[in-house]
């Protein structure tokens, strides 16, 4: 026997109080799927969360953050400030990044600068705060003599 | 034991208002979120106004907005629908609601009363 709950649309609930009717789910709530015995709860944007969808009979709201603030986890379930470039956040608020390290982003964390020699290369543009540092050609490639490319003969003089 | 009774409908020409009344015991209707639905003849039930977030908010259903009040009275224990500029398409059974918080996170709600019939007729 089909049981008459799954004729239950999304933005319904089964109401076992009414012989098993579809009712409209409640203000502040939906049901995104058919069949459901109840309604669920609207998420609500308070606060430093921003409304980005309101809640509807079939969905729920969706929420992201107000400027100076940056979404973290699935769906955004919490914000978080931002900081400057050149800075990373941390339990006492945004602080520059030590010599040596990066951000080149609102968010995240201030990352050691490439070492070009790692690679075998050079350091082409020193980096800072906000940018990381840009590798040139090896040593090598830029010593007097190793140019793999022949300079051109000399032009004779017609008649020599 | 919640009971809802609600009075006040009756037959009414368009244009005229009328005021629904639900006597609630059981439960207080000031730490409750109550509110209407309606049923239409040969139609589902509708949500047509609320008292939500302790009386943080009221909601209504687009069809009825401008011309619907939800008021409540907590020293009668009772919730109200000021209808006024009525229309042939709010002709419906009414019903007194109220919503229930189940604990998994769940929502329902509870029409336990008869409901009292408004036909907006010429």
């Known amino acids: 026997l089909q049981d008459p709950c799954s004729n239950c649309p999304a933005g319904t609930f089964c109401d076992n109080n009414r012989n098993q009717i579809c009712s409209p789910c409640p203000p502040n709530s939906f049901s995104s799927a058919g069949g459901q015995r109840t309604c669920d709860i609207c998420r609500q944007c308070k606060g430093v969360f921003r409304t980005r969808k309101e809640c509807s009979s079939t969905s729920n709201a969706e929420c992201d953050c107000t400027p100076g603030f940056h979404c973290l986890g699935a769906g955004c379930s919490m914000c978080e400030q931002d900081c400057k470039q050149g800075q990373e956040l941390t339990k006492k608020g945004c602080k520059d990044c030590c010599f040596g390290t990066f951000n080149d982003q609102k968010r995240g964390i201030c990352r050691p600068w490439t070492n070009c020699s790692l690679d075998g290369k050079s350091v082409l543009v020193n980096g800072t705060k906000e940018r990381d540092v840009v590798c040139g050609p090896s040593p090598a490639d830029l010593s007097p003599g190793a140019s793999s490319v022949t300079p051109p003969a000399p032009a004779r003089e017609p008649g020599h | 034991e919640v009971q809802l009774l609600e009075s006040g409908g009756g037959l009414v020409q368009p244009g005229g208002s009328l005021r629904l009344s639900c006597a609630a015991s059981?439960?207080?209707?000031?730490?409750?979120?109550v509110g209407w639905v309606r049923q239409a003849p040969g139609k589902g039930l509708e949500w047509v106004s609320a008292?939500?977030?302790?009386?943080?908010?009221?909601y209504y259903a687009e069809s009825v907005k401008g011309r619907f009040t939800i008021s409540r009275d907590n020293a009668k224990n009772t919730l109200y629908l000021q209808m006024s500029s009525l229309r042939a398409e709010d002709t419906a059974v009414y019903y007194c609601?109220?919503?229930?918080?189940?604990?998994?996170?769940?929502?329902?709600?509870?029409?336990r009363g008869q409901g009292t019939q408004v036909t907006v007729s010429s």
């Open positions: 008292i939500l977030d302790r009386g943080g908010s009221t």
């Open positions: 609601a109220r919503v229930v918080y189940h604990a998994g996170g769940g929502v329902t709600y509870d029409t």
């Open positions: 059981g439960f207080t209707v000031s730490a409750e979120d």
